[in-house]
Amino acid sequence: QPDAINAPVTCCYNFTNRKISVQRLASYRRITSSKCPKEAVIFKTIVAKEICADPKQKWVQDSMDHLDKQTQTPKT
């Protein structure tokens, strides 16, 4: 996968101090790169703002669960 070699790496250096309502969240992605100082979750809000959050916090894990369950393929 040569294209990924020089791909830019997004890192989080600080985490949000406040809990974000799940109604404001649209998606998330995880950051695990060894080039970053810490593992992180980046939430994208419904207004396309990106927010770094601590994956060890329960509200962050609950929010990720909520987003994943929200997008389950409906049973026919």
Epitope: S27, R29, T32, E39, M64, D65, L67, D68, T73
Partner: nanobody, 124 residues
Framework: EVQLVESGGGLVQAGGSLRLSCVAS????????MGWFRQAPGKEREFVAA????????TYADSVKGRFTISRDNAKNTVYLQMNSLKPEDTAVYSC?????????????????WGQGTQVTVSS
């Protein structure tokens, strides 16, 4: 560097059981949802089961519901797949993966860091 190593596959007769294990390293395991997928020769990768970081929420493919159980031991950085009442159509290479993006648990693009897989063969 994130690494996933599966084990526990093998040859089993129809109706038998196997327990697969996937050991993860290089990440804070307990904060990641994990999934099991399988791929049979000539077929697309198929979702089997997934579990959230804390182990409180699981989801299964219809084809394995009631027969397979996914679980995890965060102290051992390991996710398991207990497979009972195996059928010949369960024959495939089984791989675990780390969920990295929001979206349906059953969607492979939501996952990254795939293990090399372990072969499960069910004979009739």
């Amino acid at each position: 560097e994130v690494q996933l190593v599966e084990s526990g596959g093998g040859l089993v007769q129809a109706g038998g059981s196997l327990r697969l294990s996937c050991v993860a390293s290089g990440l804070t395991f307990s904060t990641y949802s994990m999934g099991w997928f399988r791929q049979a020769p000539g077929k697309e990768r198929e979702f089997v089961a997934a579990i959230n970081g804390g182990g409180s929420s699981t989801t299964y493919a219809d084809s394995v519901k009631g027969r397979f159980t996914i679980s995890r031991d965060n102290a051992k950085n390991t996710v398991y797949l207990q497979m009972n009442s195996l059928k010949p159509e369960d024959t495939a290479v089984y791989s675990c993966a780390v969920k990295m993006y929001s979206g349906s648990y059953s969607s492979p693009p939501g996952y990254n860091y795939w293990g090399q897989g372990t072969q499960v063969t069910v004979s009739s």
